[in-house]
């Protein structure tokens, strides 16, 4: 069940990523480290990468409330399970700088992607069942 | 067990808002976004948006932007939509809605009817 | 926005019926894709979460299959309590959208 809980949290992650897709334009157009085709059991080591990235707003008016709340939020740390405490301190995946770096809007897409991979690993692989908590 | 218990029916002035409130209960209230669908009568089903009872970050459709609000109170577990600048075409059945992988646990609805 | 075409609208079946209802998506959605039930006057029931889950306490007559843009409901036996209005509803991108329903009647 926790780690049910675990990947609702990467679902909510999904829509933020989606929320700050419709401000891109109002965003910082720095490059990004974006981790893609992430090696098997590295996946919450490339989301750490996703969270510690230096995404801002570009500080153009109306919208910067919305784009700050929402990059707070998506760097916001939930509890860690086993697996993602094992992964962060295997020093085979790569760190976040060997990952090649994109503007926003693709940085959005590929943490989106990766959430999207990691919730498509945990429901197939999981016995017939609900999301209940 | 996981209940959603929505407030009674509303009649409304074009013109007028609406409040409607939606109390949770059988879960952690601030685990899970609760999203706002509405269906007019003989329509189907249209999002309206989510809100996080955590910390009440919310997202719009576009279609409500400027109208709709939605706000949490953790106390009661109970999460509210407001929508202002009413029309008849906001005559519908306004429905909360608990979001884990999907819309999982719906409130009884409640029905919001604009008439001059 | 991702538009979802259900078809059909409506249907007319027996009781013991295999009964198919598809909904199809304007762009891949990645399996993202829930099933609902609504009957009159009663709270919506999610019935199947990313394209073939079952919810909990949700009959196992109700299969959920697809991929891309093309998915499916099936009800292998329809039973007297499954005459209602069904809606597709995709998770993939917001804004959240939905079906524009399948009503089954009773032939």
């Known amino acids: 069940q926790g780690q049910d809980r675990h990947m609702i949290r990467m679902r909510q992650l999904i829509d933020i990523v989606d929320q700050l897709k419709n401000y891109v334009n109002d965003l910082d157009p720095e490059f990004l480290p974006a981790p893609e085709d992430v090696e098997t059991n590295c996946e919450w080591s490339a989301i750490s990468c996703f969270q510690k990235a230096q995404l801002k707003s570009a500080n153009t008016g109306n919208n910067e409330r919305i784009i700050n709340l929402s990059i707070k939020k998506l760097k916001r740390k939930s509890p860690s399970t086993g697996a993602e405490r094992r992964q962060k301190h295997r020093l085979t995946c790569p760190s976040c700088d060997s990952y090649e770096k994109k503007p926003p809007k693709e940085f959005l897409e590929r943490f989106k992607s990766l959430l999207q991979k990691m919730i498509h690993q945990h429901l197939s692989s999981r016995t017939h069942g609900s999301e209940d908590s | 067990q996981v209940q959603l218990v929505q407030s009674g029916a509303e009649v409304k002035k074009p013109g007028a808002s609406v409040k409607v409130s939606c109390k949770a209960s059988g879960y952690t209230f601030t685990d899970y976004w609760m999203h706002w669908v509405r269906q007019a009568p003989g329509q189907g089903l249209e999002w309206m948006g989510t809100?996080?009872?955590?910390?009440?970050?919310?997202i719009y459709s576009q279609n409500f932007k400027g109208r709709v609000t939605m706000t949490r109170d953790t106390s009661t577990s109970t999460v509210y939509m407001e929508l202002s600048s009413l029309r008849s075409e906001d005559t519908a059945v306004y429905y909360c809605?608990?979001?884990?992988?999907?819309?999982?646990?719906w409130g009884q609805g409640t029905l919001v009817t604009v008439s001059s | 926005d991702i538009q979802l075409t259900q078809s059909p609208s409506s249907l007319s079946a027996s009781v013991g019926d295999r009964v198919t209802i598809t909904c199809r998506a304007s762009?891949?959605?990645?399996?993202?894709l829930n099933w609902y039930q609504q009957k009159p006057g009663k709270a919506v029931k999610l019935l199947i979460y990313?394209?073939?889950r079952l919810h909990s306490g949700v009959p196992s007559r109700f299969s959920g299959s697809g991929s891309g843009t093309d998915y499916t409901l099936t009800i292998s036996s329809l039973q007297p309590e499954d005459f209602a209005t069904y809606y597709c509803q995709q998770g993939h991108t917001l804004p959240r959208t939905f079906g524009g329903g399948t009503k089954v009647e009773i032939k």
């Open positions: 809605a608990r979001y884990g992988f999907a819309m999982d646990y």
């Open positions: 809100i996080d009872p955590s910390d009440q970050y919310t």
């Open positions: 762009q891949d959605i990645s399996n993202f």
């Open positions: 990313y394209t073939s």
